[in-house]
Amino acid sequence: AVNGTSQFTCFYNSRANISCVWSQDGALQDTSCQVHAWPDRRRWNQTCELLPVSQASWACNLILGAPDSQKLTTVDIVTLRVLCREGVRWRVMAIQDFKPFENLRLMAPISLQVVHVETHRCNISWEISQASHYFERHLEFEARTLSPGHTWEEAPLLTLKQKQEWICLETLTPDTQYEFQVRVKPLQGEFTTWSPWSQPLAFRTKPAALGKDT
């Protein structure tokens, strides 16, 4: 296993899920592999079966408990092992010590809704899902709005440098269909990364009032 052709990357959602991806060039697609998690100061351990996601990569979710339960803390270290079946025995392919709160990727924000819409502006709110209470207010958000004739990649990013679960979009065009997405990231963690984007919220601005006849 000591070569540059394999990669093992995991993230913690801050509550009760560790998601892992294992990639190995030249590995057989039908190889049976799993991830085993052993925390250094907990009585439980957990296993998940790696399932293929592409030609040379596998993924699985370590479900540590109920979705909103706080299963790990900032002082925990989890030893993660990739094991693959070779005949009747399991072969260890990789061993990684993993500090959960240095490797955070939260769930995508949920419950997006239009609070108020006008001709040129729209107020939208959302909620964070399965996020640890440890963060208190130490979160940031990025948002983007899809305008007609553009792609998501072209949409400018709006950054909210605090825990603010709403936004007021301005300078919109009247009677126009838009879509909106948001993602979240804790401020702590060496390898912490952005959550996936939320499901898009579609909304339409109100038409401009008709001018009086002259």
């Epitope: 540059g4 093992f8 990357t9 990684q96 240095e102 060496e190 390898f191």
Partner: nanobody
Framework: QVQLQESGGGLVQAGGSLRLSCAAS????????MGWFRQAPGKEREFVAA????????MYAVSTEGRFTCSRDNDKNTVYLLMNSLKPKDTAVYYC????????????????????WGQGTQVTVSS
């Protein structure tokens, strides 16, 4: 750039423990990923463990069988290797190494990835 000095090696009976230390001086320790390698007589240098700049991820050689723990203290400019349940096959010179390039802690690095090396400390495990 940093200079590295290992300590903590010695003679230990099989089943015993040792903690190796690697002290860094002369640079910004937290900007380096750190690794441990070992070389037994007549054998090639072998990867043992590597940890990222902040210690958020640490990869271990499968041969360590979960008996070793690598950690770092960026305030003390030191990286450690705690070795438990030692076996005669663990007998080797243990080297500390620093990597100036970015290391994600998601793969097994090669010795050529490391730029700076200590002088090594001898570990002998008797049966």
């Amino acid at each position: 750039q940093v200079q590295l000095q290992e300590s903590g090696g010695g003679l230990v009976q099989a089943g015993g423990s040792l903690r190796l230390s690697c002290a860094a001086s002369g640079g910004t320790f937290s900007s380096y990923a750190m690794g441990w390698f070992r070389q037994a007589p007549g054998k090639e240098r072998e990867f043992v463990a590597a940890t990222t700049r902040g210690g958020g991820r640490t990869m271990y050689a499968v041969s360590t069988e979960g008996r070793f723990t690598c950690s770092r203290d960026n305030d003390k400019n030191t990286v450690y290797l705690l070795m438990n349940s030692l076996k005669p096959k663990d007998t080797a010179v243990y080297y500390c190494a620093a990597m100036t390039s970015y290391y994600s802690g998601t793969y097994y690095p090669d010795s050529s990835d490391f730029d700076i090396w200590g002088q090594g400390t001898q570990v002998t495990v008797s049966s």
